[in-house]
């Protein structure tokens, strides 16, 4: 069937970066500026995505592939193919409808995006807290209290929070 189709359909010979031009006797024409075709045999070229406003161009459009956007500094991508840009917050905060808010006690966020998460429950794994959590950092779990030698202190104060911490992805 494929062979028959290629014999009957001249469009199947048009490579990526071209389209099968009905107005010109079905010859393969290059995609016009600001358009692309990523597969062969296409009858039209797709319009290139434009990265405007809070979006910035990560990869320019070519005749065979669409442009790719990311976000300007202070924002991060959300959704497939970076369909949205969301405001960054500081470590130790999360974005709410009212803007960036500090993490509640017992929760942390070590990134500039995402939500405040509860500190890890070390006892879930039979471990103890080795380093206390902060708004910016999770606890670090250590050995179970039974594993500690007598007189050894089990909890270390948290390491001082520093930028940049976990960078936004």
């Amino acid at each position: 069937f494929e062979r028959t189709r290629s014999l009957q359909d001249p469009c199947s010979n048009c490579p990526a970066g071209t389209f099968c031009d009905n107005n010109r006797n079905q010859i393969c024409s290059p995609c016009p500026p600001n358009s692309f075709s990523s597969a062969g045999g296409q009858r039209t070229c797709d319009i290139c995505r434009q990265c405007k406003g809070v979006f910035r161009t990560r990869k320019e459009c070519s005749s065979t592939s669409n442009a790719e956007c990311d976000c300007t500094p202070g924002f991060h991508c959300l959704g497939a193919g970076c369909s949205m840009c969301e405001q960054d917050c500081k470590q130790g905060q999360e974005l709410t409808k009212k803007g960036c808010k500090d993490c509640c006690f017992g929760t942390f966020n070590d990134q500039k995006r995402g939500i405040c998460r509860p500190w890890t429950n070390c006892s879930l794994d039979g471990k103890s807290v080795l380093v206390n959590g902060t708004k910016e950092r999770d606890v670090v779990c250590g050995p179970s209290p039974a594993d500690l030698s007598p007189g050894a202190s089990s909890v270390t104060p948290p390491a001082p929070a520093r930028e940049p911490g976990h960078s936004p992805q």
Partner: antibody
């Protein structure tokens, strides 16, 4: 005991995709980060990304953002990593790992899955 | 990304020797430094986490020290079963990054 068991070796053609699985047992799957790490032949280790299975929140190494997609199925305690548009440089052993209790270290490693890309 | 400079890339030592490997991150990572052992069969094991904390079940001949941008991993008395490649890894900042590894051989 805590265990991560990965799917078997794969041989794929350039341009194809592959989905590697990592089945967790011996702990509460939703409470720990699962990471994926790449080791190309004769090379060091590279962190690809991770997922928190409870809400499927992911982080990616920018280098692998267009290559890897990490997902998790809570019902089967299994994490997955799909690699797309495979090229010869994707030939490597891929490991899944679990954190030690907080994301900052990786205490349990799967046995590794070899992915070979060859025409 | 934080670069992890690990040295030496390989070393040969005798059973009973004291072996030292260093790891230098390109920026301050506080104490978020871990050490892993990869055996010739490719199995990987966490030995030390948070710079100096020995993972439960790991022999006490393994130790770690340092902070900020200078870290050291030591095997106090090398054993035949310690033949492996050792990696440092920073857990301070995404993306997590590893040193290039130190291949340890017995003389």
């Amino acid at each position: 005991q805590v265990q991560l068991v990965q799917s078997g070796a794969e041989v794929k053609k350039p341009g194809a995709s592959v989905k590697v699985s990592c089945k967790a047992s011996g702990y509460t799957f939703t409470s720990y980060w699962i990471n994926w790490v790449k080791q190309a032949p004769g090379q060091g280790l590279e962190w690809i990304g991770n997922i928190y299975p409870s809400d499927s929140y992911t982080n990616y190494n920018q280098k692998f953002k267009d290559k890897a997609t990490i997902t998790a199925d809570k019902s089967t305690s299994t994490a997955y990593m799909e690699l797309s548009s495979l090229r010869s440089e994707d030939t490597a052993v891929y490991y899944c790992t679990r954190d030690y209790g907080s994301a900052y270290s990786m205490s349990t490693w799967g046995q590794g899955t070899t992915v070979t890309v060859s025409s | 990304d934080i670069q992890m400079t690990q040295s030496p890339s390989s070393l040969s030592a005798s059973v009973g020797d004291r072996v030292t490997i260093t790891c230098r991150p390109s920026q301050d990572i506080s104490n978020y430094l871990n050490w892993y052992q990869q055996k010739p069969d490719k199995t990987v094991k966490l030995l030390i986490y948070y710079t100096s904390r020995l993972r439960s079940g790991v022999p006490s001949r393994f130790s770690g020290s340092g902070s900020g941008t200078d870290f050291t991993f030591t095997i106090s008395s090398l054993q035949p079963e310690d033949i492996a490649t050792y990696f440092c890894q920073q857990g301070d900042t995404l993306p997590y990054t590893f040193g290039q590894g130190t291949k340890l051989e017995i003389k």
